[in-house]
Interface confidence: medium
């Protein structure tokens, strides 16, 4: 979690002198409670916005907006603490709006916004706005929270952001899978325009229950420049268990911009439906999936006795 490296952050508006400060997420009013505290924010809204850095990079940001309740407690409102919690890591980042002048009633409802928290594709956040000073112990809460799910890199607008492009969002491998004789599966996909290695993972499951019964991983060496955008083939020797027939194939690139953390593409091959009259054919009706980024850098199991290695198709 971080703030967009922008010009000076601004929270002042007509009738209010305000400054944005870094916060430890532990306002002084927690430790030294005040007798009179403001009411909670109203109509907290979180939206996905996109902002450019000074270097010209485009990032997704959380646009946080809220209004004040129209009661006398605004006379005791000294500012607000904005907190963003990334749910999968418990990482929290806070900023503080510090009012340098006292709020007055005016004809329009007071409205505040902040658009400088950079968020990650596919992550979920809890956004909280605390009015300051915070309430006395056992006092009514004066904060409002909302969860906010950031779309992943498959989303059209997200695809062109710097973090998604760095993860390979513009690469479409167009994975195809076909079953061959002798317990084999051929995976074919389009290489990207970078001399980078790839890894293809096959995981197999039983049809009746989602029970892992086999997995294999194969490395593809970095293609030469003349092989960019060509098709690469990998042939897997499948598990010998005839019922181990539901296959999940994942292609993981190792682009220089994302290394072990690049977006993975996947297809699922269901178990064949075998009737008395039909012979199993090459699988054409695979289900494409887009795999989220994995924080893991482990590349693991292979049980591929006798399986052939990849070659590029021209």
């Amino acid at each position: 979690l971080r703030l967009l490296d922008h010009r000076a952050l601004v929270c002042s508006q007509p009738g209010l002198n305000c400054t944005v400060k870094n916060s430890t997420c532990l306002d002084d009013s927690w430790i030294h409670p005040r007798n009179l505290t403001p009411s909670s924010p109203k109509d907290l809204q979180i939206q996905l916005h996109f902002a450019h850095t000074q270097q010209g990079d485009l990032f997704p940001v959380a646009h946080i907006e809220w209004t004040l309740q129209t009661d006398a407690s605004i006379l005791y409102l000294e500012g607000a603490e904005l907190s963003v919690l990334q749910l999968n890591t418990n990482e929290r980042l806070c900023v503080k709006f510090q009012f340098l002048s006292m709020l007055q009633h005016h004809r329009k409802r007071w409205r505040f916004s902040f658009s400088h928290f950079v968020v990650d594709p596919g992550q979920e956040y809890e956004v909280t706005v605390h009015h300051l000073p915070k309430p006395i112990p056992d006092g009514d809460p004066n904060h409002q929270s909302k969860n906010f799910l950031v779309p992943d890199c498959e989303h059209a607008r997200m695809k062109v952001t710097t973090p998604c492009m760095s993860s390979g969002s513009l690469w479409d491998p167009n994975i195809t899978v076909e079953t061959l004789e002798a317990h084999q599966l051929r995976v074919s996909f389009t290489l990207w325009n970078e001399s980078t290695p790839y890894q293809v993972l096959l995981e197999s499951f039983s049809d009746s229950e989602n029970h892992s019964c086999f997995d294999v991983v194969k490395q593809i060496f970095a293609p030469r420049q003349e092989e960019f955008h060509q098709r690469a083939n990998v042939t897997f020797t499948l598990s010998k268990f005839h019922w181990c027939c539901h296959h999940h194939v994942q292609v993981q690139p190792f682009f220089s911009s994302c290394l072990n953390d690049c977006l993975r593409h996947a297809v699922t091959v269901p178990c064949p439906v075998i009737s008395n009259t039909t012979v199993p054919k090459p699988v054409a009706d695979y289900i494409p999936l887009w795999e989220p980024r994995s924080g893991s850098s482990d590349y693991k199991d292979d049980d591929d006795k006798g399986s052939s290695h990849h070659h590029h198709h021209h």
């Epitope: 993972l201 995981e203 892992s212 019964c213 086999f214 997995d215 991983v217 598990s239 010998k240 268990f241 019922w243 482990d298 590349y299 693991k300 199991d301 292979d302 049980d303 006795k305």
Partner: antibody, heavy 116, light 107 residues
Framework: QVQLVQSGAEVKKPGASVKVSCKAS????????ISWVRQAPGQGLEWMGW????????NYAQKLQGRVTMTTDTSTSTAYMELRSLRSDDTAVYYC?????????WGQGTLVTVSS | EIVMTQSPATLSVSPGERATLSCRAS??????LAWFQQKPGQAPRPLIY???TRATGVPARFSGSGSGTDFTLTISSLQSEDFAVYYC?????????FGGGTKVEIK
């Protein structure tokens, strides 16, 4: 050359747990699954389960379900097998082996004795 | 589970003679069968997989045959180092199962 080196012999009391390690060398650890097989004194071989070092998926023998846990640490190329609530009939030599269906390399074995 | 039955339990053979070991599955395992050799105090050593393919470094005197439910391991001319216990193992279905073993001893 491929080697699987297991931890030393253990003596445990009934009800206790044991954790046997299996350190792999001579190949890329992360390309092959690890299976565990045990052999009671004077008896035959019994398959205990398999762990995929790719996904962490495991497949345990039904009779050990709930008592056995298999894990790997890819940073040290080591597989672990933990067996809980030990009974006297768990006294055996425990082997790790490479691959998930047939086993092409075996560890030297770890004797686990369960005795009060 | 698939039950693997080996026979005989003990086979007495003279060095230089032929030894034939049998393994029967309670249901078809196709050719998904392996054979292992084990000597006292040692880990099993792979001999054969896929019913008839010799593992790396295994002498040509060891051969495997069969498919479905009936399998045979043949040692064409027994050497002194071949006296051991031999196990078959199926890998056609979970749980993987072993036969009870055949002990080949010197006659």
């Amino acid at each position: 050359q491929v080697q699987l080196v297991q931890s030393g012999a253990e003596v445990k009391k009934p009800g206790a747990s044991v954790k046997v390690s299996c350190k792999a060398s001579g190949y890329t650890f992360t390309r092959y699954g690890i299976s565990w097989v045990r052999q009671a004194p004077g008896q035959g071989l019994e398959w205990m389960g398999w762990i995929s070092t790719y996904s962490g998926n495991t497949n345990y023998a039904q009779k050990l379900q709930g008592r056995v846990t298999m894990t790997t640490d890819t940073s040290t190329s080591t597989a672990y097998m933990e067996l809980r609530s030990l009974r006297s009939d768990d006294t055996a030599v425990y082997y790790c082996a490479r691959r998930q269906l047939y086993f092409d390399y075996w560890g030297q074995g770890t004797l686990v004795t369960v005795s009060s | 589970e698939i039950v693997m039955t080996q026979s005989p339990a003990t086979l007495s053979v003279s060095p230089g003679e032929r030894a034939t070991l049998s393994c029967r599955a309670s249901q078809s395992v196709s050719s998904n069968l392996a054979w292992f050799q084990q000597k006292p105090g040692q880990a099993p050593r792979p001999l054969i997989y896929d019913a008839s393919t010799r593992a790396t470094g295994v002498p040509a005197r060891f051969s495997g045959s069969g498919s479905g439910t009936d399998f045979t391991l043949t040692i064409s001319s027994l050497q002194s180092e071949d006296f051991a216990v031999y196990y078959c193992q199926q890998y056609d279905n979970w749980p993987l199962t072993f036969g009870g073993g055949t002990k080949v001893e010197i006659k």
